[in-house]
């Protein structure tokens, strides 16, 4: 466990990792495969109309620890899972949307009367 105030940079992978990408493919991707020094991810989130949208792709090592931590964001239903154990490992990630809370209806951007 890291002590409070201590921060360690994530260890660089010894080699490039290939990930499946969908709705999140960078300009150098080929056949929906991207390359990274960090993590593969799959994310599910609600779009503006409340429909679930799944995206997947590559996260660079810089900042990926934070992005993969999946910190809850108020008024936003979103879940992300990350992996590094093998190429295209994110094909097997299936994050689910966190359950709706009652207060989401009250505090959300659209108020129902």
């Amino acid at each position: 466990k890291k002590e409070d105030g201590e921060s360690t940079a994530p260890t660089p992978r010894p080699k490039v990792l290939r990930c499946k990408c969908h709705h999140h493919c960078p300009e150098d991707s080929v056949n929906n495969i991207c390359s990274t020094d960090g993590y593969c991810f799959t994310m599910i989130e609600e779009d503006d109309s409340g429909l679930p949208v799944v995206t997947s792709g590559c996260l660079g090592l810089e900042g990926s620890d934070f992005q993969c931590r999946d910190t809850p964001i108020p008024h936003q239903r979103r879940s992300i899972e990350c992996c590094t154990e093998r190429n295209e490992c994110n094909k097997d990630l299936h994050p689910t949307l966190p359950p709706l809370k009652n207060r989401d209806f009250v505090d959300g951007p659209i108020h129902h009367r």
Partner: antibody, heavy 117, light 113 residues
């Protein structure tokens, strides 16, 4: 030190198949990708494909799909490339090379493949 | 596929002279996410296998003499040998590793007068 050992030469009949080998030493095989590159006499270099020995994930140059098959034997730290339905166009020097980040930091000495009857 | 074009195809220089050779790619090799150019240079001496000189367009490989200098960005790259030596007699190849399939230039043959 890092070494990629390849046999010096192979002579094969047209229409046959051949399996070229590349024995890695001096590093952990699974920490690097292994690539294969073709060089015809007096010509440039052509990337055939690569394999990640840790999970045997492969990428191929579309020009070599169906021609080349890449495999690895982790127990002997050896990478292989099988070439099928050989013709005179396949006569070339074939190099194995390793990479962490898709540039090739160590190369084998190359195997000269001659396809002739 | 990304096409790599090298020029000149051959050149003859005297020991001590400055040598420059060019490599142009059919599309940019600059990755926006990390501002790195995905280009490498190799030296192939007669009867030998290629040897890595430079990667990420300008980073010299460990053990390579500092007379070898890589430069350029985007689509135009240069390998400079600041003071050519007799042992630099070789073919020089550039390679892009921005998008699969990785491709090489046709090479520049350096002869020593």
């Amino acid at each position: 030190q890092v070494q990629l050992q390849q046999p010096g030469a192979e002579l094969v009949m047209p229409g046959a198949s051949v399996k070229l080998s590349c024995k890695a030493s001096g590093y952990t095989l699974t920490n690097y990708w292994m690539h294969w590159v073709k060089q015809r006499p007096g010509q440039g270099l052509e990337w055939i494909g690569d394999i990640d020995p840790s999970d045997t994930y492969t990428n191929y140059n579309h020009k070599f799909k169906g021609k080349a098959t890449l495999t690895v034997d982790k127990s002997s730290s050896t990478a292989y490339m099988q070439l099928s339905s050989l013709t005179s166009e396949d006569s070339a020097v074939y190099y194995c090379a390793r990479s962490g980040w898709d540039y090739f930091d160590s190369w084998g000495q190359g195997t000269t493949l001659t396809v002739s009857s | 596929d990304i096409v790599m074009t090298q020029s000149p195809s051959s050149l003859a220089m005297s020991v001590g002279q400055k040598v420059t050779m060019s490599c142009k790619s059919s599309q940019s090799l600059l990755k926006s996410s990390n501002q790195k150019n995905y280009l490498a240079w190799y030296q192939q001496k007669p009867g030998q296998s290629p040897k890595l000189l430079v990667y990420f367009a300008s980073t010299r490989e460990s053990g390579v003499p500092d007379r070898f200098i890589g430069s350029g960005s985007g689509t135009d790259f240069t390998l400079t040998i600041s003071s050519v030596q007799a042992e630099d007699l070789a073919d020089y190849f550039c390679q892009q590793y921005y998008r699969i399939p990785w491709t090489f230039g046709g090479g520049t043959k350096l002869e020593i007068k």
